[in-house]
């Protein structure tokens, strides 16, 4: 908790790591051959930059930021990734008809830098 202390984006509004929603069809996702429903998914994903201390997931992320400043060619900046997920249920095609299947890591719920 101590590490994740920066929620102010120094790069300006909407530029740092955040939850972003994209409306996508089954065709867009390449799922049309095995998923029947929903036909459209509001895909929530994590997008944006991870400047110093911004939503740092842990001390490792802070170290990564510091070393990236010193050695940008060697150490990459922290990445914006899901901190947790919302589950989603899909109606899928099966050999015998249709079935329900739940996925617990499909949609981002919130984001952090790691």
């Amino acid at each position: 908790a101590r590490a994740r202390n920066g929620d102010h984006c120094p790069l300006g509004p909407g530029r740092c790591c955040r939850l972003h929603t994209v409306r996508a069809s089954l065709e867009d996702l390449g799922w049309a051959d095995w998923v029947l429903s929903p036909r459209e998914v509001q895909v929530t994903m994590c997008i944006g930059a991870c400047p110093s201390r911004f939503r740092a997931a842990n001390m490792h992320a802070q170290i990564k930021t510091s070393l990236h400043r010193l050695k940008p060619d060697t150490v990459p900046a922290p990445c914006c990734v899901p901190a947790s997920y919302n589950p989603m249920v899909l109606i899928q095609k099966t050999d015998t008809g249709v079935s329900l299947q739940t996925y617990d890591d499909l949609l981002a719920k919130d984001c952090h830098c790691i």
């Epitope: 029947l36 429903s37 929903p38 036909r39 459209e40 509001q42 919302n86 589950p87 989603m88 249920v89 899909l90 109606i91 249709v98 329900l100 739940t102 617990d104 949609l107 719920k109």
Partner: antibody, heavy 119, light 110 residues
Framework: EVQLVQSGAEVKKPGESLKISCKGS????????IGWVRQMPGKGLEWMGV????????IYSPSFQGQVTISADKSISTAYLQWSSLKASDTAMYYC????????????WGQGTLVTVSS | QSVLTQPPSVSGAPGQRVTISCSGS????????VNWYQQLPGTAPKLLIY???NRPSGVPDRFSGSKSGTSASLAITGLQAEDEADYYC??????????FGGGTKLTVLG
């Protein structure tokens, strides 16, 4: 305002057929799945099945497979639950419910339809 | 017999805090989510908590949900007379799809 309005109470005899309805309004009916839930007198909730009104794909709980039929008519934003031959043990309150966006929970419920089967 | 196990009844005095447990297994709560519904006497169920700990708009913050391992719980603080109702947990099970707990009757004393 999202609303699910169910048809009125029914009293039937064993062996008779029945079709009850659930009309959705205040939202895009084809964008959300509809589920049916049974509550027998003094008992808990039991999931019966789900339908995607846009493609009429249906999936049933193993406990209700072959016992009931779930259907929908998207032109009138209505889902249905039907029996071809009722039994006394079908006496219960039946609720339709709309699934939330991710298909994992029921965010709006109908008022329920009480079905009584008695000779 | 429900896949998810809840106590049949709990009670508390106005203003108190009560919790309702929901016990499952590794094939349901253990790997997935839990939702909670409130059913006031003579009415349809109403969504109270979804995806473990999220409240729909309009639900007071006196209601909160949590999940740990294969169990979940619903906490109600500042108990009020109008909270007297049946409460159901609901999850997903790999064999039965959507499953409910057997329900817990909450009685507000006094």
């Amino acid at each position: 305002e999202v609303q699910l309005v169910q048809s009125g109470a029914e009293v039937k005899k064993p062996g008779e057929s029945l079709k009850i309805s659930c009309k959705g309004s205040g939202y895009s009916f084809t964008s959300y799945w509809i589920g049916w839930v049974r509550q027998m007198p003094g008992k808990g909730l039991e999931w019966m099945g789900v339908i995607d009104p846009s493609g009429s794909y249906t999936i049933y709980s193993p406990s209700f497979q072959g016992q009931v039929t779930i259907s929908a008519d998207k032109s009138i934003s209505t889902a249905y639950l039907q029996w071809s031959s009722l039994k006394a043990s079908d006496t219960a309150m039946y609720y339709c419910a709309r699934y939330g966006r991710y298909g994992t929970y029921f965010d709006y419920w109908g008022q329920g339809t009480l079905v009584t089967v008695s000779s | 017999q429900s896949v998810l196990t809840q106590p049949p009844s709990v009670s508390g005095a106005p203003g108190q805090r009560v919790t309702i447990s929901c016990s499952g297994s590794s094939s349901n709560i253990g790997v997935l989510y839990v939702n909670w519904y409130q059913q006031l006497p003579g009415t349809a169920p109403k969504l109270l908590i979804y995806s473990n700990d999220n409240r729909p708009s309009g639900v007071p913050d006196r209601f909160s949900g949590s999940k740990s391992g294969t169990s979940a719980s619903l906490a109600i603080t500042g108990l009020q007379a109008e909270d007297e109702a049946d409460y159901y947990c609901q999850s997903w099970d790999s064999s039965s799809n959507y499953v409910f707990g057997g329900g817990t009757k909450l009685t507000v004393l006094g």
